[in-house]
């Protein structure tokens, strides 16, 4: 008995598609070995038609593919544009065609139901529009035109030129009679339903001279597109429903076990709470197409999704839809990173953002998810160094630690900073991730003064107190600019055993600016890190004023006022396109700040770790 399993018999009609799923035991070897679909010949040999290694036979070119779903232990063979010649005996299998694990499949492609001679076949997806063409002779031009539906042996009138409309087609059908000289009338049916499926008869005139034309209408449910994404990653559903519904409310819903469809998000402002913070519906293009992005994928997000259009913002029969079957791969390439990061008011957070390590040169971004209406995610910072104005001095995006992870640091936290943030790049969109920042009770671990005013030409010392738990961490001061935070050169940090023992008097790292220049004005951060992994930071704003009093200026670390009002900087306004999903800026038009200029000069700034006694007792 072969462990490979699939459908023993598959039957379809000419012109249609089939999607054949074969199951195999998902052992490590099986998951990664070659998968194939072959046709058994008279000689008993099985000729490969399509394989997981990219081979497609000439007979299948452009109409077939094979997709492996290793985690599920399945692979799917899709074959389109079936013809009677495709009928035959096949095998789906693993390894080598002649010896390996396989399963026999019989495919039968029939002509479809016997139709009257001259029948025109119309194949249309549910919810779409069909135009049935009905020719007639000149003598029937002035006579009644009608469309009937054949049900069994009877014909039921659907519409006629005397303004009759069958109630089943009310508000979605019209009969058009062209001007003189054109010997054809048309019947347009909108918002097709599955129940509209069947054989129709056009008629012009009556009696033995009447004109008749048969039309076979096949209304199909859209074939779901199989989508296979990684756990913790992101998926994008592109939905193009046509111009007819460009101005109608749009939605994405998920099919439940009762075969109804629960709204995930719609353009009327509804959103499923399970997707809070990790979903966006981008603005529509002129043609009515739109996209929905879901990040932070979970196993429970798997299922069948439909997008559609209806004034109620939810699924209704007879309106156009598109379908996807989402599978979430638990063997994810996307590394685990915290989905919730906690910080205290006045403190900071350091968020690790994964990106595709093959795309180290890609631009990195961080945006704030806003749930209003369809959701938007205005960019706050990007690796090119542009930072939104209100985040000046407290937000930085660092390329470290690199190799598939970048870091975003946000300090001077307030309760307003609580919310969902997205990490993204201008590369692989599947690596978008979501992190929630929560503001909890507590005190910041690093203590720096609030307002600092330095005097031109003099020496400035700024202390930063840290608790014992950071004694083994690397301490640093850096000068913030909108392109990052430039680490300032560090002076001797004192005897290392002082930190090991965590002497009460050694929990201080000081920044010295000597002499102070105009260029020193700006934001400075005190921070701790371990290797390339950043911990807490604290920010202090240094204002520079003209000399009034001689002598060095010492600042008390105990006086931690709020930071001064941020400087108003010239703001360039950047237009963000709504090419939503390709455009990483994610549906926002944002202000950005120009670069704030020079960094502090190297030799004039120094970082000193010393005891608080050396601060002249200013902390007492």
């Amino acid at each position: 008995k072969s462990p490979v399993f699939g459908p023993q018999e598959v039957s379809s009609v000419e012109g249609n598609s089939v999607s054949i799923k074969c199951y195999y035991p998902p052992t490590s070897v099986n998951r990664h070995t070659r998968k194939y679909w072959c046709r058994k010949g008279a000689s008993g040999r099985c000729i490969t038609l399509v394989s997981s290694e990219g081979y497609v036979s000439s007979n299948y070119a452009g109409r077939a593919n094979l997709t492996n779903f290793p985690e599920n232990g399945t692979f799917v063979v899709n074959i389109a544009q079936l013809s009677r010649d495709d009928s035959g005996h096949y095998k789906c299998g693993l390894g080598i065609n002649s010896r390996g694990l396989s399963f026999d499949v019989s495919l039968e492609v029939s002509q479809g139901p016997e139709l009257p001679n001259g029948t025109e076949v119309y194949t249309v997806d549910v919810g779409r529009t069909v135009t049935i063409k009905c020719p007639f002779k000149t003598e029937n031009a002035p006579k009644t035109k009608a469309l009937y539906k054949k049900i069994g042996q009877t014909s039921v009138l659907v519409i006629d030129s005397r303004n009759y409309v069958n109630p089943n087609y009310k508000d979605r059908i019209r009969l058009r009679i062209p001007g003189t000289g054109q010997l054809i009338f048309t019947v347009v049916i909108d918002r097709l339903r599955l129940s509209d499926h069947g054989l129709y008869l056009c008629q012009a005139g009556d009696g033995s001279n009447r004109d008749e034309k048969n039309a076979d209408l096949q209304v199909l449910e859209p074939e779901p597109e199989l989508v296979y994404e990684d756990l913790r990653g992101s998926v994008t559903f592109h939905c193009a429903l046509g111009l007819e519904v460009a101005n109608v409310a749009k939605f994405l819903c998920r099919v439940n076990s009762r075969e109804t469809c629960d709204v995930v998000i719609n353009t009327l402002g509804k959103r499923d709470s399970a997707f809070e913070g990790r979903i966006l519906l981008n603005p529509q293009d002129k043609d009515g197409s739109f996209s929905v992005v879901i990040t932070g994928l979970r196993k429970e997000d798997e299922g069948r999704y439909l997008c559609g259009a209806h004034s109620d913002g939810q699924l209704q029969e007879g309106w156009p839809i598109q379908a996807w079957q989402l599978f979430v791969n638990e063997e994810s390439t996307i590394p685990r990173s915290p989905t919730v990061v906690k910080g205290v008011a006045g403190g900071s957070v350091a968020v690790l953002c994964p990106y595709n390590p093959k795309e180290s040169q890609s631009l990195k971004y961080w945006c704030l998810w806003e749930g209003a209406q369809n959701g938007r995610c205005p960019l706050l910072v990007e690796s090119q160094g542009l930072v939104q104005e209100q985040y000046e001095g407290r937000l930085s995006l660092l390329q470290e630690p690199g190799n598939g992870t970048f870091t975003v640091i946000l300090n001077q936290l307030t309760t307003q900073d609580a919310g969902f943030y997205w990490c993204l790049t201008n590369g692989d969109t599947r690596w978008r991730t979501t992190v929630e920042i929560k503001i909890i009770e507590g005190e910041p671990n690093l203590k720096v003064p609030g307002n600092v005013t330095a005097v031109l030409g003099e020496t400035l010392n700024i202390p930063c107190h840290f608790p014992c738990k950071f004694s083994s961490y690397e301490k640093y001061w850096c000068k913030w600019s909108n392109t990052g935070c430039q680490t300032l050169p560090s002076q001797d940090e004192g005897p290392s055993e002082a930190f090991v023992n965590c002497d009460e008097n050694s929990r201080l790292v000081s920044l010295t600016l000597n002499p102070v220049t105009r260029a020193d004005e700006g934001w400075y951060w005190c921070g701790v890190k371990q290797g390339h992994f950043y911990g807490e930071t604290a920010a202090v704003y240094v204002a520079v004023e003209e000399k009034k009093v001689a002598g060095s200026r010492y600042v008390s670390p105990a006086k931690a006022d709020a930071a001064p009002d941020e400087k108003v900087l010239d703001s360039g306004v950047r237009e963000i396109e709504n090419k939503a999903i390709q455009d990483p800026r994610l549906f926002a038009e944002e202000k950005v700040v120009a670069d704030t200029g020079d960094q502090a000069g190297g030799s004039r700034a120094s970082v000193d770790s010393s005891s608080s006694e050396e601060q002249g007792g200013s902390s007492k």
Partner: nanobody
């Protein structure tokens, strides 16, 4: 909601034939799945056959031991699935259950893939 009612079970001799029916009421769309499972005395419930359809495509699945003897089919208009059982053997004795699901993506052999179940019909094959 979909309700399923099985019929056609009974007592037959080995080698005889029997046809089981499963009538579905309620909404069934242009896609879905119907399966037959059985539970013999003192045994686990096991897969027998399944039929999946999507638009005009039909997929039929069989358990190895019934291949060539059992045939699954469906009458669209009557919303009914059938299991034609030929060359019956004593080991086919079991309660046969019909199952249905609006989705066509689960493994048809997995009973957990089906949302709706009938109450079962007993088939006894004497030697």
């Amino acid at each position: 909601e979909v309700q399923l009612v099985e019929s056609g079970g009974g007592l037959v001799q080995a080698g005889d034939s029997l046809r089981l029916s499963c009538a579905a009421s309620g909404r069934t769309g242009s896609s879905g799945a119907m399966g037959w499972f059985r539970q013999g005395p003192g045994k686990e419930r096991e897969f027998v056959a399944a039929l999946m359809w999507r638009n005009t495509v039909t997929y039929k699945y069989y358990e190895d031991s019934v291949k060539g003897r059992f045939t699954i089919s469906r009458d669209n208009a009557k919303n009914t699935a059938y299991l034609q059982m030929n060359s019956l053997k004593p080991e086919d004795t079991a309660v046969y259950y019909c199952a249905a699901d609006p989705d066509t993506y689960g493994d048809p052999r997995n009973s957990g893939a089906y949302d709706y179940w009938g109450q079962g019909t007993l088939v006894t094959v004497s030697s």
